[in-house]
């Protein structure tokens, strides 16, 4: 459910939301670290109704949720990290 991507693309998020989404309605979370053409960290949430939203990384709820997911994944499977080579 938690994915970290390193990409050479520019920022993916045009606008960000702080609105709470309970984990039960989240399909997966994609984290795009700052850099490689985008000056800010981005968090993209895929919801179970097939819609996608960019979430403000400063939103308290997403920070809490990612902490829970990190703890959970460290006790089971490692968080998948997908690295794209920068040309």
């Amino acid at each position: 459910v938690l994915e970290v991507y390193y990409t050479s693309l520019r920022c993916r998020c045009v606008q960000e939301s702080s609105v709470f989404i309970p984990r039960r309605f989240i399909d997966r979370i994609q984290i795009l670290p700052r850099g490689n053409g985008c000056p800010r960290k981005e968090i993209i949430v895929w919801k179970k109704n097939k819609s996608i939203v960019c979430v403000d990384p400063q939103a308290e709820w997403i920070q809490r949720m990612m902490e829970v997911l990190r703890k959970r994944s460290s006790s089971t499977l490692p968080v998948p990290v997908f690295k794209r080579k920068i040309p």
Partner: antibody, heavy 123, light 106 residues
Framework: EVQLVESGGGLVQPGGSLRLSCAAS????????MSWVRQAPGKGLEWVAT????????YYPDNVKGRFTISRDNAKNSLYLQMNSLRAEDTAVYYC????????????????WGQGTLVTVSS | DIQMTQSPSSLSASVGDRVTITCKAS??????IAWYQQKPGKAPKLLIH???TLQPGVPSRFSGSGSGTDFTFTISSLQPEDFATYYC????????FGGGTKLEIK
């Protein structure tokens, strides 16, 4: 005091449609997501639909997806369930329930429920 | 989809008895389980959420425990008003209710 009052149930033929309503009071309706849960006669509880506090997001289980539509009117403190292409297996008491607090970050489940309205699908 | 297997489906007990109901999830649901009480002709009432957190006003004789896939709901000393049907609900991944446990007077 939180109150949820369902209405709109009744007898409908297979293939027919029905619209259920739920009037909410005693809390800030626009701050909470809302859900519908049903219970077939003598059976257990089954989740039917959930809508976010602002009404922009809706979620359904596969067995009602495409047939049922949940909606809300925050100005009227009202929740709705439009049910189309009804089948005999949709016969149940339908409850509306208050769901998570949308302005927070707590993973709370449905806490307050109405008394339900009976929907009977039969020819 | 997550399946919730609740057992037993029915249970006979006496006032003062200690009663335990279990729910097993088909996959890890962390601690995202709730327990409801339902009396005939009435709406379900939330007793416990997040495995063990009691709702305000719910007597302390009700308790819950577990994590991952195995969860337990306990009534430490049955009171006459406790005879009802109890349901578990997982809310880690959408919603799934257990099949219910009907608690009857012996």
């Amino acid at each position: 005091e939180v109150q949820l009052v369902e209405s709109g149930g009744g007898l409908v033929q297979p293939g027919g449609s029905l619209r259920l309503s739920c009037a909410a009071s005693g809390f800030t309706f626009s701050s909470y997501a809302m859900s519908w849960v049903r219970q077939a006669p003598g059976k257990g509880l089954e989740w039917v639909a959930t809508i976010s506090e602002g009404g922009s997001d809706a979620y359904y289980p596969d067995n009602v997806k495409g047939r049922f539509t949940i909606s809300r009117d925050n100005a009227k403190n009202s929740l709705y369930l439009q049910m189309n292409s009804l089948r005999a297996e949709d016969t149940a008491v339908y409850y509306c329930a208050r769901d998570y607090y949308g302005s927070g970050y707590e993973e709370s489940p449905m806490d307050y429920w109405g008394q339900g309205t009976l929907v009977t699908v039969s020819s | 989809d997550i399946q919730m297997t609740q057992s037993p489906s029915s249970l006979s007990a006496s006032v003062g008895d200690r009663v335990t109901i279990t729910c097993k999830a088909s996959q890890d649901i962390n601690k995202y389980i709730a327990w409801y009480q339902q009396k005939p002709g009435k709406a379900p009432k939330l007793l416990i959420h997040y495995t063990s957190t009691l709702q305000p006003g719910v007597p302390s004789r009700f308790s819950g425990s577990g994590s991952g896939t195995d969860f337990t709901f306990t009534i430490s000393s049955l009171q006459p008003e406790d005879f009802a049907t109890y349901y578990c609900l997982q809310y880690d991944n959408l919603y799934t209710f257990g099949g219910g446990t009907k608690l009857e007077i012996k």
